[in-house]
């Protein structure tokens, strides 16, 4: 499974979009988890609404928000007020009972804002318009890394 690398600026928002086959994953909740080490477990950060029909509603845990468009097959995770400690390897997961299937692996990199200790003046940009939309927005940086992943069957 490929790992998507996303870069975000400290203090701003990073938006991750994980796409999936909506019919294949029918009825499954989605989750965003943080990988603890190379082979370690993936620690749940936030998951979608317990009632699948309400998965479109935003669920928040701290500064992380998740929402799922189950018809379009896109789960969106927003990491607000990005901090250096948010950098690391994450997973978008599809849940069925106790099973968690990896939809996408995401490596989050946090860039220090060069204007952090200076007067930004007219260069200040509202948070919403400076969010990163996965690999789909021009001013975000993303690349793919080939990583091995054991077969599911």
């Amino acid at each position: 499974l490929n790992t998507t690398v996303l870069q975000g600026m400290a203090g701003q928002s990073l938006r991750v979009s994980c796409t999936y086959d909506a019919l294949k994953h029918w009825g499954r909740r989605k989750a965003w988890c943080r990988q603890l080490g190379e082979e370690g477990p993936c620690q749940r950060v936030v998951s979608t609404h317990g009632v699948w029909l309400l998965a479109f509603l935003k669920k928040r845990n701290g500064s992380t928000v998740i929402a799922d468009d189950t018809l379009a097959g896109t789960v969106t995770i927003t990491l607000k007020n990005l901090q250096a400690g948010d950098a690391g390897l994450y997973q978008c997961q599809s849940l069925r009972g106790r099973e968690a299937e990896v939809l996408q692996k995401v490596l989050v990199e946090v860039l220090e804002d060069p204007l952090d200790d200076q007067d930004a003046g007219d260069l200040w940009v509202p948070e919403e318009s400076s969010s990163f939309e996965g690999a789909q927005v021009e001013h975000s940086t993303s690349r793919n890394q080939e990583t091995s992943f054991p077969p599911t069957s």
Epitope: D21, L23, K24, R28, L53, R96, G97, T152, S153
Partner: antibody, heavy 122, light 107 residues
Framework: EVQLVQSGAEVKKPGESLKISCKGS????????IGWVRQMPGKGLEWMGI????????RYSPSFQGQVTISADKSISTAYLQWSSLKASDTAMYYC???????????????WGQGTMVTVSS | EIVLTQSPATLSLSPGERATLSCRAS??????LAWYQQKPGQAPRLLIY???NRATGIPARFSGSGSGTDFTLTISSLEPEDFAVYYC?????????FGGGTKVEIK
Amino acid sequence: EVQLVQSGAEVKKPGESLKISCKGSGYSFTSYWIGWVRQMPGKGLEWMGIIYPGDSDTRYSPSFQGQVTISADKSISTAYLQWSSLKASDTAMYYCARLGRKPSGSVAFDIWGQGTMVTVSS
Amino acid sequence: EIVLTQSPATLSLSPGERATLSCRASQSVSSYLAWYQQKPGQAPRLLIYDASNRATGIPARFSGSGSGTDFTLTISSLEPEDFAVYYCQQDYSWPYTFGGGTKVEIK
């Protein structure tokens, strides 16, 4: 009409290989999971495994992992169940079934094949 | 894997009587439970999904209830064609296991 049509009955000897089929029609074959269910003579239903023909993602029940292989050819809307070396204990009726989607997010086997009787005897 | 236990194994009743079949899960399956009917020489047929929703074309005399670990299939007034074997199945997590079945026979 939405239906699943299975291949005919088979009589085999122990150690032989076998591949039975299940052809879907009347719906988008690639968009529904297809499951296989075993029913030994006079016994209940056993969930063997399941495949999503769209990408051939497959799941097996622990009891059947390594014993059978489930596959699909989406170009001809057909799912398969195969054995490399049959045993007498494989004698059973085998059903394929479509995992239908319900509005609430649940799924259930809503369309069933007619079954394929496999007899393994020396 | 989740184990489903059905009881009783056999239910002997007369036409017109009420049948109550039980299915118990080894752990919670929420409401992700279905019921199937199988007659001799036939493939199973979906009766109930989501524990309580009747499948298309299923008569109103069939009803399901329960959530978590305890479920019930009720046939309010048995018709001659209802004498068959009934199976519960969970679709909460892989593998989607079946119960052992309850045979409803004519008394």
